[in-house]
């Protein structure tokens, strides 16, 4: 009931945009800037001075960044007692990009809304917003979480249910951006297992694999461009790298999607009525990985059953030699442990500076692909010559 | 495979991709609450962080959260 | 503080009609979607109808489409419910609700409509 | 429309007894859901939201849980304010509707 007492502004400084514009350029990322949308004139339009500020500074520097307005702004009302409603957030949209193409930012790139998940009057809010403003983003940003940390329980994670809700929720994005504005690239702007931090002794846990392998294979399949995880590193228990800078199971498993998982999204299915607890993925391979080459397939599935599996490759790949990149939980707290094995080897860091090999398993052609119970696995399905991927 | 073994056969459809998602399809965030951590120069200076940071490259670094909305820049703070 | 006070109920015959209002206070009333909510003597409860922040959008349950009416006025922080051809199964106990996506946090105390005749 | 199941129907425990009561959605609804407590004469008050977040000012003795289509509302002690009927309502679409109500009586 009105808890928009619960936050209050703080400021940041030049040295801080230093540190974080200077920490994504040294590690090969490109740098998104969430500016603060609850500045407002007495007449609820957005205003741009603080922004302004900000871009001149970013400007003198010669960043390169992209930007967002605003986050989760259906929520305004329960975090602030404001409401905006999408027409006017479209209006201050518009605002941003002039500025931005008043500056030495004339091609930066402009992201948004970030709603949370298309509830009914949050798919409302994106609608009016993407016919407001819909024009002047590059992308379409949207959050989504599984879960609420505070309650959420192992069987959760390991619940084919849940990880099913998310469809429904990419669908109605999608019903909302083809009726505003069709075409219009869709990404997660924000998203992780449970909300509220994550959940205490499972969001950085083995188990909370599945939620994420099923969410980009989900993501990939449905038509969403870019996924970005909730958090790379910070407080909470969803992070990827925790605050001893050690990597967690969920940073090994984006480790290996990155180096192992291409751009072109084709399409894996279980042949039956089971398939909820086995979920299969298929791409063309990351060509940028040395050990392929154009024309294979990378396949990525996850078993939810509690025996093992043996998935049976179809015509004309059956007889192709395959290399098996399984993930299984190390040590006595099993799907809750914070190690992870590949191929039975345990992932660390070798020292600050290098990140171990990940070392496939040829298997030998011919042979099923064997996934033990609660586990997932990347099979990369070599010489596969696969004509959309080349 | 033996004939007591749990076998699923898959079906692929590879004629022509589904989708072509970003080749930075898989990013990650910094929750801009960091930003207001003590720390927050130190931690993001940190050799290790970068190096696994750089693992992931290409790909986005989104700084939000619900701290973006109360976050005001000070070019004077020091 | 938020009050939400409904007003307007009482005994009416079968085919005959009502308006409720509900006064509200505390809160921004323009930010907030509004809902009515009614409960029949005894039984559960049963949404009727919500409407947008700015009136444009209204939504009501099947039984009383055509008959009922949701409308507001912001400037006088005022939720209405006009109800025509009023029958005997709607007579309740009803409610006026502050509505979130998530939960309706605030309800009067409600207002009864007997029909009768 | 979504029509909402509560179990069981009514209920009597005893203070410091803990009570589970769920409510089953003909369909997925995410986690749309919201508990309310209704004491006689009274209007309904909002305890859980979003099937799992407790109101601000609501006893933490109370939770919920759940997601898609089976929810559960958990008085962990029940104390003696807490008899009372308890209903689960849904807002992922609508028509919104609520289950028909669980009545917590004293044994």
């Known amino acids: 009931a009105d808890p928009g007492k619960k936050f209050k502004n703080s400021t940041y400084s030049r040295s801080s945009v230093d540190v974080l514009y200077t920490f994504a350029n040294c590690s090969g990322l490109d740098l998104i800037f969430g500016l603060n949308a609850l500045l407002r004139t007495a007449d609820l339009q957005w205003n741009s001075s603080n922004a302004q500020l900000l871009l001149d500074y970013c400007s003198s520097k010669g960043y390169n960044i992209s930007w967002e307005l605003g986050n989760e702004p259906n929520s305004f009302l329960k975090k602030a007692d404001i409401f905006i409603n999408g027409s006017q957030l479209g209006e201050d949209f518009i605002q941003l990009h002039k500025l931005l193409r008043k500056s030495t930012f004339k091609n930066a790139k402009l992201y948004g809304p970030d709603v949370g998940q298309p509830r009914r009057k949050t798919a409302k809010m994106l609608k009016s917003f993407l016919k407001a403003g819909g024009e002047v983003i590059d992308s379409v940003t949207w959050h989504h979480y599984y879960l609420n940390g505070r309650t959420a329980t192992k069987e959760d994670f390991l619940n084919p249910d849940v990880l099913d809700i998310f469809i429904s929720s990419v669908q109605k994005v999608f019903q909302v951006v083809e009726s505003t504005r069709p075409g219009k690239k869709v990404w997660l702007g924000e998203t992780s297992s449970a909300y509220g931090g994550g959940a205490p002794l499972l969001s950085d846990t083995f188990a909370a694999g599945f939620m994420w392998l099923d969410k980009l294979g989900l993501s990939a399949r449905m038509g969403i461009e870019v996924v970005m995880r909730q958090v790379f590193f910070g407080a909470g228990n969803y992070h990827l790298v925790d605050e001893n800078f050690d990597p967690l199971p969920d940073y090994w498993l984006s480790l290996l999607f990155k180096k192992l998982v291409g751009t072109k999204v084709l399409m894996a299915s279980v042949q039956g009525s089971k398939r909820r607890k086995l979920r299969v993925y298929l791409h063309c391979t990351n060509t940028d990985n040395p050990r392929y080459k154009e024309g294979d397939l990378t396949l990525y599935a996850i078993n939810l059953h509690n025996v093992t599996k043996y998935l049976r490759l179809p015509y004309p790949f059956s007889n192709k030699q395959v290399d098996k990149y399984l993930l299984r939980p190390l040590g006595p707290h099993g799907l809750l442990s914070k190690s992870v094995q590949l191929n039975g080897l345990t992932l660390k860091m070798v020292d600050d500076q290098t990140l171990p090999p990940l070392m496939e398993k040829p298997l030998r052609p011919g042979s099923s692909l064997g996934l033990p119970a609660f586990s997932y696995s990347f099979f990369v399905i070599r010489n596969a010559k696969v004509a959309a991927c080349i | 495979a033996d004939p007591g073994q749990d076998v699923v056969d898959l079906d692929f459809f590879t004629q022509e991709p589904l989708h072509l998602v970003s080749p930075s399809f898989l990013s990650v965030t910094i929750d801009a609450n960091l930003a207001t951590d003590p720390r927050f120069l130190i931690l993001l200076g940190s050799p290790k962080l970068r190096t696994l940071a750089r693992g992931l490259s290409p790909a986005y670094l989104r700084f939000g959260g619900t701290k973006t909305d109360f976050l005001i820049f000070d070019p004077k703070k020091e | 503080e938020v009050q939400l006070v409904e007003s307007g109920g009482g005994l009416v015959q079968p085919g005959g009609s009502l308006r409720l209002s509900c006064a509200a206070s505390g809160f921004t009333f323009s930010s907030y979607w509004m809902s009515w909510v009614r409960q029949a003597p005894g039984k559960g409860l049963e949404w009727v109808a919500s409407?947008?922040?700015?009136?444009?959008?209204?939504y009501y349950v099947d039984s009383v489409k055509g008959r009922f009416t949701i409308s507001r006025d912001n400037a006088k922080n005022s939720l209405y419910l006009q109800m025509n051809s009023l029958r005997a199964e709607d007579t309740a106990v009803y409610y006026c609700a502050r509505e979130l996506d998530w939960g309706w946090d605030y309800w009067g105390q409600g207002t009864l409509v007997t029909v009768s005749s | 429309a979504i029509q909402l199941t509560q179990s069981p129907s009514s209920l009597s425990a005893s203070v410091g007894d803990r009570v589970t009561i769920t409510c089953r959605a003909s369909q997925g609804i995410s986690s749309a859901l919201a508990w309310y407590q209704q004491k006689p004469g009274k209007a309904p008050k909002l305890l859980i939201y979003d099937a799992s977040s407790l109101e601000s000012g609501v006893p933490s003795r109370f939770s919920g849980s759940g997601s898609g289509t089976d929810f559960t509302l958990t008085i962990s002690s029940l104390q003696p304010e807490d008899f009372a009927t308890y209903y689960c309502q849904q807002f992922n679409s609508y028509p919104i509707t609520f289950g028909q109500g669980t009545r917590l009586e004293i044994k």
């Open positions: 409407i947008y922040q700015d009136g444009s959008e209204k």
